[in-house]
Structures are given as structure tokens and as C-alpha cells.
């Protein structure tokens, strides 16, 4: 608000007023009269820049008159009262109401005093974020999508992630005239490491007190990545049972595990139990390559492990799952 003048009447009003599409807004406008100053106000006038005529007038004897009587109203001016408050209420804000307005006091003996106010017509956008479920492509693809619908002015969308990625943002007219829908895609080369990680879409808009943060949990579909654990190269005759585990990461989840050897089916000392393979005690040395084949909706992958059971004392050796 501009500071009051010294020794003269001054019109006080904010330089900019925000209002929401379809709502009502008050354009505040007051005449500041210093203590020792005397003034008489006979008319209050509101006009819009670039348009002919006044949109609203409050006349000392005729009262209020409006260019659109259903949409405008003097908030405080009354016949028979001192005209010091020219504040004007506008109903059913439209996009085309955005612009510069002049509030003017016709005073005596100071003359006309006016101020300009910029009315900003805003529309609060609705924001959504969703994952774009992808498969391994080897090329950058949209992995997340953030949409800010029906904003005025257009919302600003940014992405926050430690995975890298590039945004691709576009705009189209919103459903309501003068509004804009902003769509931002977050693009990255899909990898299994990205699956299940989060990225954040940040939407900023004049109508928000603070930015809106929307988190997206990424989904990458990929065939199984397989490894076998549980063997430490220290298996000896006479030891207790040991267990090998077929470790598989995949999306979607594995649908089946199949154990075999390079020679064909499992030997009698090896018993498959889903993702685990139970190795029973043996009485003679072994040198066998085991295969774990894992299947999911996208395909099958396998891992191999050569297992040796050697002669020697089993007492002090670790690395075997014992009963």
C-alpha cells in the first residue's frame, strides 16, 4: 500500500488484487484524509483501462449506478454518508475481468484523486501425479507424469530426484476458458535399479500458500536378475546339511524356480524347496555345477554355481548352513 501523503488527500489501494475465477473479489479503495485537511467527496468512479465509460459510479445524490448491476456493488458507500470508501465488489469473476482499474474520488477543493489497481484473475489448479509403468527399453521413456489441471496462470512443474532424469513439459487450454492444463513427464532410461524408487513432482502456483509436492513410486518391469548364495567354497565331507538360496529380483515377482545341473536333473543329495536347495551330507567328494532358473511374466533367467565338497576336517570351517 502506498504511504499516505503529507498535507493532501491520497487514495489508498493495493497495486494488485487477486481474485478467483467464478468467485467474488473486492477491489479496496479508500480516501486518506490528513487530520487538518478538509475534503468533500461528491462522486466515486470506477473505470477499466481500455474501455469506454465508467463501470460503476456512486453519486452523492443519485447513489450507485453500474454498467453491470448484477456483478458490481459498492461495499461501503451509502447515500447521506461521507464518501471515503470506494471499495467495489465484483461477482462471478471472469477471465476477461483481469486488467487495470482506476478508482477515482471527485473531491472539493482538492480536485480528482485516483489510483490504479491491477485485478489478477486466478484459477486454482488440481494436481495429480502418476507412475508410467515401463519395461526395460534401453532408451529414455516417460516414467512419471504430473498434471496440473485448470490453472490460471499456468502452474510451474519441477521434478526432484537423485536419479537424474529429464522433464518434458507441455501446456494445453483448460476446460474453463483462460485456464491452462500443464503436463510434465519425467523421462529416464529404465533400469531395475530405478524400480521402487521415488521421484517428487513439485507444483507451484500463485494460488498456493506453499508448493504442492506429489511423490511417485517408480515401476520398471524387468525379467529376473538371478544369483545363488549360501556357498563359501569351504564345504567338506561329513558336514551337516547346507542350504543354497536362489536370489531373484524381478518385477513382477517370480512365478517359479527350477533347480537343475549342467548334467541334467538334480543328484539325490540335492533337494529343491522353491527358491532354496537343500544339500544333504555326502560321503564322497563332489564337483557339480548347479543351475537355478527363475521365471516371471517377462521371461526366465538363470544363474550357475559350481559346488565342491572336498575331503578334509569339517570342524572349524564356516560358510555352510547347518541344522
Amino acid at each position: 500500500w502506498p504511504p499516505p501523503g503529507t498535507g493532501d488527500v491520497v487514495v489508498q489501494a493495493p497495486t494488485q488484487v487477486p481474485g478467483f475465477l467464478g468467485d467474488s473479489v473486492t477491489l479496496p479503495c479508500y480516501l486518506q484524509v490528513p487530520n487538518m485537511e478538509v475534503t468533500h467527496v461528491s462522486q466515486l468512479t470506477w473505470a477499466r483501462h481500455g474501455e469506454s465509460g465508467s463501470m460503476a459510479v456512486f453519486h452523492q445524490t443519485q447513489g450507485p449506478s453500474y454498467s453491470e448491476s448484477k456483478r458490481l456493488e459498492f461495499v461501503a458507500a451509502r447515500l447521506g454518508a461521507e464518501l471515503r470508501n470506494a471499495s467495489l465488489r465484483m461477482f462471478g469473476l471472469r477471465v476477461e475481468d483481469e486488467g487495470n482499474y482506476t478508482c477515482l474520488f471527485v473531491t472539493f477543493p482538492q480536485g480528482s484523486r485516483s489510483v490504479d489497481i491491477w485485478l489478477r484473475v486466478l484459477a486454482k489448479p488440481q494436481n495429480t501425479a502418476e507412475v508410467q509403468k515401463v519395461q526395460l527399453t534401453g532408451e529414455p521413456v516417460p516414467m512419471a507424469r504430473c498434471v496440473s489441471t485448470g490453472g490460471r496462470p499456468p502452474a510451474q512443474i519441477t521434478w526432484h530426484s537423485d536419479l537424474g532424469g529429464m522433464p518434458n513439459t507441455s501446456q494445453v487450454p483448460g476446460f474453463l476458458s483462460g485456464t491452462v492444463t500443464v503436463t510434465s513427464l519425467w523421462i529416464l532410461v529404465p533400469s531395475s535399479q530405478v524400480d521402487g524408487k521415488n521421484v517428487t513432482c513439485k507444483v507451484e502456483h500463485e494460488s498456493f500458500e506453499k508448493p504442492q509436492l506429489l511423490t511417485v513410486n517408480l515401476t520398471v518391469y524387468y525379467p529376473p536378475e538371478v544369483s545363488i548364495s549360501g556357498y563359501d567354497n569351504n564345504w567338506y565331507l561329513g558336514q551337516n546339511e547346507a542350504t543354497l538360496t536362489c536370489d531373484a529380483r524381478s518385477n513382477p515377482e517370480p512365478t517359479g524356480y527350477n533347480w537343475s545341473t549342467t548334467m541334467g536333473p538334480l543328484p539325490p543329495f540335492a533337494v529343491a524347496q522353491g527358491a532354496q536347495l537343500l544339500i544333504r551330507p555326502v560321503d564322497k567328494p563332489i564337483n557339480t555345477t548347479l543351475i537355478c532358473n527363475v521365471t516371471n511374466a517377462l521371461g526366465a533367467r538363470q544363474a550357475e554355481l559350481t559346488v565342491q565338497v572336498k575331503e578334509g576336517p569339517p570342524s572349524e570351517h564356516s560358510g555352510i548352513s547347518r541344522n
Epitope: 478538509v38 461528491s42 462522486q43 468512479t45 465508467s54 482506476t102 471527485v106 472539493f108
Partner: antibody, heavy 116, light 107 residues
Framework: EVQLVQSGSELKKPGASVKVSCKTS????????MHWVRQPHGKGLEWIGG????????SYNQRFKGRVTITVDKSTSTAYMELSSLRSEDTAVYYC?????????WGQGTLVTVSS | DIQMTQSPSAMSASVGDRVTITCKAS??????VAWYQQKPGQPPKALIY???YRYSGVPDRFSGSGSGTDFTLTISSLQAEDLAEYFC?????????FGQGTKLEIK
Amino acid sequence: EVQLVQSGSELKKPGASVKVSCKTSGYTFTEYTMHWVRQPHGKGLEWIGGIHPNSGGTSYNQRFKGRVTITVDKSTSTAYMELSSLRSEDTAVYYCARWTGDFDYWGQGTLVTVSS
Amino acid sequence: DIQMTQSPSAMSASVGDRVTITCKASQNVGTNVAWYQQKPGQPPKALIYSASYRYSGVPDRFSGSGSGTDFTLTISSLQAEDLAEYFCQQYQSYPYTFGQGTKLEIK
């Protein structure tokens, strides 16, 4: 009913002064500024100045500054306009008019003739 | 001072005619313009304030328009009783100034 009743015609010699009165009724005198406008015969209107009865604050047309004095008597709801150092070109009908930004009520006019 | 230039200075029209009088300000006066009607031997009568708003009691055949520097008074259907002189006036800044008048005669 709002009424502004002015004093009668005046014939004055050049160099003299004239004081025209305007008695008001039908409204609250102190709530409206009173102005004076003149009209030479067959010519246009010329604003002279005005006064706010409550404060006594005045505004004058620079063309008349120093020669014109506008006053009020709140007790009788009357406004006065005094013009001094009269010249022949001051011959005109003088109107008082209630100010509402524009002038919504006018007196009937007072003819002031300046002639030697 | 702001000059108010009125045109035409005189015109003659028939009953039922549409009549337009214009007034041009030498600088921007916003919408702070009034129009007056003055019949012979009478004081002026206020018709329009703030460029386009009619005083109560003024017939709706009288209308005003404009803002900035160009203003118009229109009589949509001239009546015999509209024989008069018409003046525009600006009250944007002191000194208040009037147009020189348009004398309207009935044919």
C-alpha cells in the same frame, strides 16, 4: 424540494464591486459544496469557483483570483459571491449551482450589468 | 486549462430524428463529464453525469457515452420539447470548463 433562490439583477459601474446571494432550501446546506458559474449573454458557461459550507474551503478559477470572494452564512443557508474591480466584460448572468461533481441544481440566475 | 470543444455549434433536426452532439477534451478527463440542457431564459439542467449515467427523471431518449477525450450526447428520438442549448462540462480538474454549447433547433 431543493431550491436555490438568487438575489435580483444588479447594474454596476466599472471598478465597482457586486455581491450576489444564493439562498438554499430543501436540503442540508452543509453537506454540499456551492459553486458559481457565469454566462455572458448568448455565450457559454464559465466556472468561477466554489466553497464548502462546512469547512469554508474554497477553490477559484485563476482567471478571477484576487477579484472574487465566495462566502457562506450557515445560519441562513446562504452562499455569496462577491466580484470586485468590475469591467464591462463581467456583464453576464451569474448562477449559483449545487456541486455533486457535476452541478445538479442551479439558481435562477442574477443578471449583473457593468456599464458606465 | 482543459478545453472542451463541442460540435456542431448549432443544428436543426426534425421530431423523431436521432441527434448526436460531440464534445472533445483537450486532455484525458476519464469519465468526469456532465451534459446540461439549457432552455431559453432558464438555468442549465443536469442530464448526464460521469459521461454515461442519466439523472433520475431525465427521459431515456437521452444517453451519454465516451471516456478519455471523446464524448457524445445522443437524443434517440427528438421531441419538440428538446429545443434547447446543450453543454458538456469536465470536472476532472480545476478549473472546471464547459463546451461552448450546441444550439438545437426543431425543423
